[in-house]
Interface confidence: low
């Protein structure tokens, strides 16, 4: 591209009397200094257009010569008012004055959109003096312009606390389109309209875009930027993307998928974390989610039994964490499980079922029917029950645990007997005599000890009392009488 | 772009509640869970839950189970987060966060985060 | 709930260093579900890694992540000065999320 510098305003000479616009004169600088102002006043301007006609804000002095003429307003010389170029090319401006010798500590600022240009900018101030004035002379350099280099730029100068502005000079930095808004990635319901925007901005002005999809252009017309395009609707995914054109070119956004949402795939590998009596610990993988969240999960479970009436058992999670307890399970069962999960657009099929079991567990009925008496002469408490019934069991019965407790006059001690699986009878030592004797009888599996039955008191009486009559539960349903030993 | 902006700083006395706003824009709101995130001062980041807002479905902390409502409003893509029964421990910045689904969970856009200070 | 240890706590390094943080997670967690933020002073938390190995958009190729199981990896090659920040590790696994406690980086 072409550098072009356009004038708004006709300048005037740059420099009146002796100092011609050139430079190219006698006259060398007497200091060249690069540019490093100290203070950062607000700013105390409004810019003017180019074209104006007047020159900044302008100083009269109020000190007068020896003959007492007033001296000169002073005031920036005009330079050129809108300067236009491309990208990455270099550009050089400047302003000028012309000050009066009697003033001292003259500094010029260069500021750009109402903020001082500090540090590391290429500008630079040459001082040109003569008898009665200097010549000053800010260049004002950048070796290769960005877009944000755009702006409008003036000199500033104090003298005896009042400031002088210059007329702004705009920098105008021309380049291909630049995006402000790209059209992002989406996931759409099938055949439901959805709306992608784009935006890209100069200079220069205008830009115009096309929209591109899958490769083919949209619109037959540019629009003006930005552009909403409205896609009725898509059944299958496609990729869009926007050209932008100005007079310098074209830039092509970033090519963004718009994704059919669709039912999510099964979840795979369902693993068994954990298993007890009455619940399983289960997680999976989810599937793909379809382009959509997943909301819920579903947990199948059916009894793998080939006898039960395959009834499904339906248990409803969170999608997170993929994981869930399934509760309420018999012991010592199997099922098969299978997980299924949805999203706003329907349920998944159910993932590979996978098999189960729960471990035993402790019993769940205290064993029936326990009778104790005293055997007195033997100084011994025999103690009979009936096995729990087996299904309730919840596993395969490995013994009984016995409590006796013995109490008599403010004394109480418990002691506990372990029996066998085989046995249906025990023999405990009489611990105390003139007391109660209470005995609890549970069942106890590979699960763990199963309730205690109900309490079953005796009197063991002082030595040589006797009493034969057994104590005892009745076992429900059963009429029959005990046989005492 | 997607941006999420959060309401302003809040002091509040112990025992009080607080509510935060969280207004999303650049995306569609209804089709990803705002999370809410803290981070007591000098400390690390801690969730305390998210909503669907396109049903409003929410998932919180157990930690603050009973003492946070997480709700949104659709037709100006916001949403709220309300703490009751403040504590002192409870100052904190508070990050409104996009939940990215893909199944696993991340956050890809945060609030600037509102200070909410607890103090009598 | 899923417990994310980071190691170092805190880290001093040179520019142009290589730096490697680690988190542990106190239960094996996909890859896939494990993910990387950065936070500089008072600034928001910012994705800088995702499912492990994933640079979030923006982030340089300096970043890279790895791991598997229970032990995953943040490495940051030729480290420069704006990488001065807080990494935390969070895992998208299970409910709580959780985030590992930090590791604040400062460059020397």
């Known amino acids: 591209a072409i550098t072009e510098a356009r004038e708004e305003a006709k300048p005037y000479p740059l420099f009146p009397g002796p100092f011609p616009g050139s430079l190219q004169t006698d006259h060398t600088p007497l200091l060249s200094l690069p540019h490093a102002s100290g203070y950062q006043p607000a700013l105390m301007f409004s810019p003017t257009q180019p074209g104006r006609p007047h020159t900044g804000n302008v100083a009269i002095p109020q000190v007068t010569s020896v003959e007492s003429k007033p001296l000169p307003p002073l005031a920036f010389k005009h330079t050129v008012g809108h300067i236009i170029l491309s990208e990455h090319k270099g550009v050089k401006f400047n302003c000028s004055i012309s000050v009066p010798n009697i003033y001292q500590d003259t500094t010029i600022s260069w500021w750009k959109d109402g903020k001082e240009l500090l540090g590391a900018h290429h500008a630079i101030t040459q001082f040109y003096p003569d008898d009665e004035v200097t010549a000053i002379i800010a260049s004002f350099s950048i070796t290769s312009v960005q877009r944000s280099d755009n702006g409008s730029y003036i000199c500033k100068m104090k003298i005896n606390n009042e400031e002088i502005v210059s007329d702004p000079i705009y920098i105008e930095v021309q380049g291909l389109p630049h995006f402000t808004k790209q059209p992002e990635s989406m996931n759409v319901t099938r055949n439901t309209a959805f709306n992608l925007t784009c935006q890209a901005v100069g200079p220069p002005e205008p830009v115009n875009i096309f929209w591109v999809q899958n490769s083919s252009r949209v619109n037959e017309q540019p629009e003006k930027s930005p552009s909403v395009l409205t896609v009725p609707g898509l059944t299958e995914m496609a990729v869009f993307s926007c050209e932008a054109h100005n007079d310098k070119g074209l830039t092509v956004s970033k090519g963004v998928q718009i994704n059919i949402k669709a039912i999510p795939s099964p979840p795979t590998e369902v693993s068994i974390r954990n298993s007890t009596a009455h619940s399983i610990l289960i997680s999976w993988v989810p599937g793909f989610d379809g382009y959509s969240p997943f909301r819920n999960c579903s947990i199948q479970v059916k009894e793998a039994d080939p006898l039960s009436n395959g009834s499904v058992m339906i248990f409803n999670t969170s999608a997170l964490p993929h994981l869930y307890q399934i509760k309420q399970l018999q012991a010592l069962a199997n099922y098969s499980i299978g997980v299924s999960c949805m999203n706003e657009i329907g349920w998944s099929a159910v993932s590979p079922w996978i098999l189960a079991s729960t471990t035993e567990g402790a019993p769940s009925v205290a064993p029936l029917n326990v009778t104790v008496f005293l055997n007195e002469s033997s100084d011994n408490v025999d103690i009979r029950w009936m096995k729990p019934p087996t299904k309730q069991q919840d596993g395969e019965l490995v013994g009984y645990r016995i409590s006796h407790v013995w109490q008599s006059a403010g004394i109480s001690k418990e002691l506990l007997e372990e029996v066998g699986q085989n046995g249906s009878r025990a023999r405990i030592s009489v611990q105390v005599h003139n007391a109660t004797c209470t005995v609890r009888i549970a069942a106890v599996t590979r699960g763990g000890v199963g309730p205690f039955s109900d309490p079953v008191k005796i009197f063991i009486p002082a030595h040589g009392w006797v009493d034969y009559a057994p104590s005892s539960t009745p076992a429900p349903g059963n009429a029959d009488p005990v046989l005492i030993i | 772009q997607v941006q999420l902006v959060q309401s302003g700083a809040e002091v509040k006395k112990p025992g009080a509640s607080v509510k935060v706003s969280c207004k999303a824009s650049g995306y569609t709101f209804t089709t990803y869970d705002i999370n809410w995130v803290r981070q007591a001062p000098g400390q690390g980041l801690e969730w305390m839950g998210w909503?669907?807002?396109?049903?409003?479905?929410?998932k919180y902390n157990e930690k603050f189970k009973g003492r946070v409502t997480m709700t949104t409003d659709t037709s100006t893509s916001t949403a709220y987060m309300e703490l009751r029964s403040l504590r002192s421990d409870d100052t904190a910045v508070y990050y409104c966060?996009?939940?990215?689904?893909?199944?696993?969970?991340?956050?890809?856009?945060w609030g600037q985060g509102t200070t909410v200070t607890v103090s009598s | 709930e899923i417990v994310l240890t980071q190691s170092p706590d805190f880290q001093s390094v040179t520019p142009k260093e290589k730096v490697t943080i680690t988190c542990s997670a106190s239960s094996i967690i996909s890859s896939n579900y494990f993910h990387w933020y950065q936070q500089k002073p008072d600034q928001s938390p910012k994705l800088l890694i995702y499912?492990?190995?994933n640079l979030a958009s923006g982030v340089p190729s300096r970043f890279s992540g790895s791991g598997s199981g229970t032990d995953y990896t943040l490495t940051i090659n030729s480290l420069e000065a704006e990488d001065a920040a807080t990494y935390y590790c969070?895992?998208?696994?299970?409910?709580?999320?959780?985030f590992g406690q930090g590791t604040k980086l400062e460059i020397k």
């Open positions: 909503i669907y807002p396109r049903d409003g479905y929410t």
């Open positions: 969070q895992q998208g696994r299970s409910v709580p999320l959780t």
């Open positions: 966060t996009r939940g990215y689904y893909d199944n696993l969970y991340y956050f890809d856009y």
């Open positions: 499912r492990t190995s």
